[in-house]
Amino acid sequence: GSERTCCPVNWVEHERSCYWFSRSGKAWADADNYCRLEDAHLVVVTSWEEQKFVQHHIGPVNTWMGLHDQNGPWKWVDGTDYETGFKNWRPEQPDDWYGHGLGGGEDCAHFTDDGRWNDDVCQRPYRWVCETELDKASQEPPLL
């Protein structure tokens, strides 16, 4: 496969990754699909430095990231280990709150207005951030 050496138009390069910041809202699953359709993934935050970069670009707006616990344990969409990785939850979060009246708990993580993380109902139409790594060989599947 070919390697991507520069970011696509309208994406922002930072530390050998490319980021795309939405200006509209989607449910978490739809945002996840949007990123995958760009051969990318919802942003995976691996450091305080990356947290500050993303926070600078999204401003004080609820924004989905690539972290969820829809199948039990918290997982990053790219397989990055959650337990040993960077975390920036708000105090008392995640709390899997059931009091919202929308059915079920809260299984998807988002940046809040101060940048710290909260778990929320995955159907809420929040903005989102896609990320893809530079120098990653693009996977070309076999033709049928």
Partner: nanobody
Framework: EVQLLESGGGLVQPGGSLRLSCAAS????????MHWARQAPGKGLEWVSS????????YYADSVKGRFIISRDNSKNTLYLQMNSLRAEDTAVYYC????????????WGQGTLVTVSS
Amino acid sequence: EVQLLESGGGLVQPGGSLRLSCAASGFTFSRYPMHWARQAPGKGLEWVSSISPSGVSTYYADSVKGRFIISRDNSKNTLYLQMNSLRAEDTAVYYCAKPSNPRYYFDYWGQGTLVTVSS
């Protein structure tokens, strides 16, 4: 100039198969997700399927899931739609479409290819 040229349509019996192609030119095909949509006689446009630039990620409307397969060959600048187990309700003009950048809408469409499923 961007051009999308569909081919492969025709008359097929229920349960049969067809493979549609869309030859693309005038843009860097390998950098764009691509899409198939269709319009049945007297009905509105319906999204059918989408594929990421590398072909790794694919998406399907519920109405075609498990029967249609989208694929692409970036070396040939060509998009495909393999249509199996065809039904009368699949009768439509099928269009390939290129998204704008940013992805707000489809900015280029092919002229379409007619698929008729009838016994």
